[in-house]
Interface confidence: low
Amino acid sequence: FEIALPRESNITVLIKLGTPTLLAKPCYIVISKRHITMLSIKSGERIVFTFSCQSPENHFVIEIQKNIDCMSGPCPFGEVQLQPSTSLLPTLNRTFIWDVKAHKSIGLELQFSIPRLRQIGPGESCPDGVTHSISGRIDATVVRIGTFCSNGTVSRIKMQEGVKMALHLPWFHPRNVSGFSIANRSSIKRLCIIESVFEGEGSATLMSANYPEGFPEDELMTWQFVVPAHLRASVSFLNFNLSNCERKEERVEYYIPGSTTNPEVFKLEDKQPGNMAGNFNLSLQGCDQDAQSPGILRLQFQVLVQHPQNESNKIYVVDLSNERAMSLTIEPRPVKQSRKFVPGCFVCLESRTCSSNLTLTSGSKHKISFLCDDLTRLWMNVEKTISCTDHRYCQRKSYSLQVPSDILHLPVELHDFSWKLLVPKDRLSLVLVPAQKLQQHTHEKPCNTSFSYLVASAIPSQDLYFGSFCPGGSIKQIQVKQNISVTLRTFAPSFQQEASRQGLTVSFIPYFKEEGVFTVTPDTKSKVYLRTPNWDRGLPSLTSVSWNISVPRDQVACLTFFKERSGVVCQTGRAFMIIQEQRTRAEEIFSLDEDVLPKPSFHHHSFWVNISNCSPTSGKQLDLLFSVTLTPRTVDLT
């Protein structure tokens, strides 16, 4: 190989061992019988050399540094050449470095031809191995602007006082052009300006200077985003740290076209703007840091650019001003994403503060809009608390558990609407009365409606789930001893059409000791399936539940249990079941941990089924499933 560097070229070539060097298989640069591991060639020198091994690329790297002095003479602006040409260099991993020194009053602009650049974070690498490392200068201190790959959005970087650009090319890469040019600009009065151009939908992740280390104290850095007017941009902060400020405040400032309040100032912990049409600027301003404990300011953020949806131009009013103790959350439904570029899906408050989830609270009127390619990606979860603190005031009081129409009119599917029903301990109990009788969801007879009510205890220490119930059954009411949550869960978009079928009234009633009482009025010719609460996990210890089953005068009820034995094994106490005729008070008692469950039995009058649990041994829980079927009395049942 021969490398000849012209005089006054201000180029230095350095060939040195890369890492890791494996010294047991030594490879040397050979110059007239001398074996050396490092070679430096300066302007005006011509050197002929070879390598002592077959694959020098596994051992050596080459650095070509060109110093460009704009202090003492004119700056050579324009397209930057790779000198010496890559074809004249040995095939080693090569780094071309351009070190440009200029006055503070001169702005320098690096312009990147297509493909533009994509910033990468610490620990990331570029797929093709080609990296651009860009640094600036503040007085004598070097500041890392960032490391970039090809195929991104960054088109220009403006700095002042000097710039150091390192282009790293792997030995096998055919690139023979620098891909950028340098232009002079007026002073930018800040650390740097990075221009990011979006041609269409896409995203860019960008970082503050020196990331992940601290942003220089009291500095200003700006990103200019060029976005087609028909697209919308949203900013989200992926990672940030705040330093300890002595004077001034760290902040981000947005210059948003059309905004009457430019610049809009945000704290880093604020929700950042979304749904911005067209170009905008974002600036990061540092502060004067505490000398004793400076901390670090750093920021990594993402800009997402996408088409606005029809919904994004509509404003929805959610009036919760008359509600109390209620919160509504719109959030992404959990799904596996497979598309390469997934447009963001945001909900915006007052059209500007957009985020992937939003919680609205009662007592106010809220204006929301959506910035989302597919609103089925979002759903709504609502929580409302109805509590009684004074038992004398609440007794016999009723509340309707209805989803407010304002919520039903939103273009987002309702997932859960939960009512937390709270009563004073040992003073009051609750009764739930549905507008339409309910069916309990079982494997044998699953619900196939668009919504169900999930009823569970709301006492933190108690793990008690009464079950899932849907309209169209035989359960007339459910009485529960103490605090519960009732969740209306939707299963299909058709809930909007079936919303009229929802309707549940809760009343506060005198306290009773049983955990739950189900009032069942079976319809003729249909089989009613009922099961004990906490199915699959077992009825909690020492819990008692009853079913009040009505039998019309002209009907006979057949009570059938679906297994021979209950399977429960008691550690302490007894588990038993009582079947009691309501008219005669005649009762049969079964020891569930010893006896065989009763064979199908026929009841001419209304009757009770009461099941009380012991303290079972783990793994031997009490789960019972039974059915009630009505048949006309005229049929001979023998």
């Epitope: 890492t19 890791p20 060097t21 494996l22 010294l23 047991a24 298989k25 030594p26 074996h35 591991t37 694959s55 596994n58």
Partner: antibody, heavy 118, light 112 residues
Framework: QVQLQESGPGLVKPSETLSLTCTVS????????WSWIRQFSGKGLEWIGY???????NYNPSLKSRVTISVDTSKNQFSLKLSSVTAADSAVYYC????????????WGQGTLVTVSS | DIVMTQSPLSLPVTPGEPASISCRSS???????????LDWYLQKPGQSPQLLIY???DRASGVPDRFRGSGSGTDFTLKISRVEAEDVGIYYC?????????FGQGTKLEIK
Amino acid sequence: QVQLQESGPGLVKPSETLSLTCTVSGGSISSYYWSWIRQFSGKGLEWIGYIYYTGRNNYNPSLKSRVTISVDTSKNQFSLKLSSVTAADSAVYYCAREGGWGPHFDYWGQGTLVTVSS
Amino acid sequence: DIVMTQSPLSLPVTPGEPASISCRSSQSLLHSSGYNYLDWYLQKPGQSPQLLIYLGSDRASGVPDRFRGSGSGTDFTLKISRVEAEDVGIYYCMQALQIPYTFGQGTKLEIK
């Protein structure tokens, strides 16, 4: 933490080919040299050869005619084949990673005993 | 091939006492880089060898500072300042200057 695991048959018949595989986990097989070393029952250690992820290799001249070391970067594995084995090739076979400076073997597998017998 | 010779072949030591193992190579292991291409390994009973010292005197990570490697050219020494019960096993030196790498025959350290 880098881990190496040898696998292969523990018994090989004389004149057949001994085949072992070393699976590297907890790190990439790229950018290091990977060696096979064996230890005879008398506790003596013998270096067999190394391979680089590009396929470049180097063998102990005493075994060169019988040994082949290959690499599969997609599986993070490298393999040893030793042909025409005799009882003298019975040993515990180790795979090891060669550290960047020195070189030295900074990570070793737990070893696999291979017996050559009919 | 470079021949490596260790002595002694067996070394009984009382816990808390120092120990010294010698390793001699048939030719100089001093590389043009200025490093000696000699490594020390310890093989504890039932285990794989583990690296103690590389480049003649550099301790591997996690190796206690009671282990010290010294020497240059053809004569090298591994010293243990205070032997502990966990130090028992066979100590090997290995040259890494030339292919093939070659090992010493091993020194068995045992507790008295």
